[in-house]
Amino acid sequence: ATKLTEEKYELKEGQTLDVKCDYTLEKFASSQKAWQIIRDGEMPKTLACTERPSKNSHPVQVGRIILEDYHDHGLLRVRMVNLQVEDSGLYQCVIYQPPKEPHMLFDRIRLVVTKGFSGTPGSNENSTQNVYKIPPTTTKALCPLYTSPRTVTQAPPKSTADVSTPDSEINLTNVTDIIRVPVFN
C-alpha cells in the first residue's frame, strides 16, 4: 500500500517553502488543484487554488502563496514566500473533482516557522531569501467553497505504527524527523 507521509519542514521567518505534490498525469492534468491548511478538529481550509481548468506552468499568486501546475509533468509546485511564524501548521494539496470529493495528494507538509534568521548566504540553501519575480498578469483563481465531512482529518497518530485505511489502500505514517530543505543524505 502507498504510504501517506507527513514531512516536516523547519524554516525561519522570511524564508520560502518550496514544495511539490505529484499526481496521476492521465487523470488529473487539467483538474483544479488547491493548497489547504489543516487545523486540528476543523475542516481543511483552502488558501489558494489553480484556475479551472488548470493552465500548464502558469503561476497563480494568492497573497504570499504561488501555485504552478506542471501538468505535462504531473506536478503541482507550491511556494509560500516570506514565511511568518503564524504560517506554521499542517498543509496538503488536493485536486477538486466535483461533484466528487477532493482527492488528497502526497505528501502532507508539517511546516514549522521560527523567529530569527539563521546564517549568512552560503551557509545553507534555506538562508537565502529568494525574491520570486511573478509576472503582474498572474491571476487569483476562485476556489470552490464546498468542503466535505470526509475531508476532515485528524492529526497523525503519535506512534510510528501504520494506520490502515482499507477503502483507499493508504497508510498514514508519522514521520518524526525534520527536513531542513534540501535534504539529500
Epitope: K20, L25, G74
Partner: antibody, heavy 122, light 107 residues
Framework: QVQLVQSGAEVTKPGASVKVSCKAS????????INWVRQATGQGLEWMGW????????GSVQKFRGRVTMTRNTSITTVYMELSSLRSDDTAVYYC???????????????WGQGTMVTVSS | DIQMTQSPSSLSASVGDRVTITCQAS??????LNWYQQKPGKAPKLLIY???TLETGVPSRFSGSGSGTDFTFTISSLQPEDIATYYC?????????FGGGTKVEIK
C-alpha cells in the same frame, strides 16, 4: 551504504524496446524521487523524467512522452525505465539518480547509478 | 525551456591554478542551480547545490556563487584529480536542463 545499482548493457534493434532497472539500497526507498538522465557518447547530460516511488507517479520530458514508461517495485526497492520505439539516436548511457525528498522542489541528484549503456543498431 | 550556457567549453590550467567556469541561464532562476563533476567513464557527482552550498564530503577548494541568471563555479587550487567535465543544472522550472559542460584539463 546508499547506492543505486543498474542493470547491464543492452544491444537492441531500431523499433524495439529496452527496460533498464535501478535498484536502490541504504536509504528509505519511498522517500526520495528517482530521476533518469541520459548521455550520448561524447555529449552532455539530458534529463528524461522522474518517478516518486511512494505514489508511483511519474513524469517525463515532452520529447520522450509516449515512449518512456517508469514503474517501480517497492518490495525489491527497484525502479524501471522502459523506452520504446528505439531509434539509433537513443544510443546512450542511461543513468538513474536519486533526487530530493519527494515533497521538496530541490532537484539535486546526489546519488547516481553506474549507468547502463544502450546501443540501438540494426 | 530554460537554456543553460556554460563557458568556456574547455580549458587547460596548471596544478595550483584558480579555475573559473561560468553558467548563464536564459531567464532568472533565483539560486536554483547545481554543479556536477563527471570523470571519464563515470557517473556525474554532485558538488554544489542551491548555487553555493557544498555537498557533504566535497573538498572546500570547490565553490559556487551567483543568483538570477549568472553563476560561477570556482576551483581555488586545481588538483590533478580535478580533471573532469563540469556541468551546471537548473531546477527553477521544468524541464530540468543542464549546461553543455566544461572540460577541465591539466597543462
Amino acid at each position: 551504504q546508499v547506492q543505486l545499482v543498474q542493470s547491464g548493457a543492452e544491444v537492441t534493434k531500431p523499433g524495439a524496446s529496452v527496460k533498464v532497472s535501478c535498484k536502490a539500497s541504504g536509504y528509505t526507498f519511498t522517500r526520495y524521487d528517482i530521476n533518469w538522465v541520459r548521455q550520448a557518447t561524447g555529449q552532455g547530460l539530458e534529463w528524461m523524467g522522474w518517478m516518486n516511488p511512494n505514489s508511483g507517479n511519474s513524469g517525463s520530458v515532452q520529447k520522450f512522452r509516449g515512449r518512456v514508461t517508469m514503474t517501480r517495485n517497492t518490495s525489491i526497492t527497484t525502479v524501471y525505465m522502459e523506452l520504446s520505439s528505439l531509434r539509433s539516436d537513443d544510443t546512450a548511457v542511461y543513468y538513474c539518480a536519486r533526487g530530493g525528498i519527494s515533497s521538496s522542489w530541490h532537484w539535486a541528484f546526489d546519488i547516481w547509478g553506474q549507468g547502463t549503456m544502450v546501443t540501438v543498431s540494426s | 525551456d530554460i537554456q543553460m550556457t556554460q563557458s568556456p567549453s574547455s580549458l587547460s590550467a596548471s596544478v595550483g591554478d584558480r579555475v573559473t567556469i561560468t553558467c548563464q541561464a536564459s531567464q532568472d532562476i533565483n539560486n536554483h542551480l547545481n554543479w556536477y563533476q563527471q570523470k571519464p567513464g563515470k557517473a556525474p557527482k554532485l558538488l554544489i547545490y542551491g548555487a553555493y552550498t557544498l555537498e557533504t564530503g566535497v573538498p572546500s577548494r570547490f565553490s559556487g556563487s551567483g543568483s538570477g541568471t549568472d553563476f560561477t563555479f570556482t576551483i581555488s587550487s586545481l588538483q590533478p584529480e580535478d580533471i573532469a567535465t563540469y556541468y551546471c543544472q537548473q531546477y527553477d522550472k521544468l524541464p530540468l536542463t543542464f549546461g553543455g559542460g566544461t572540460k577541465v584539463e591539466i597543462k
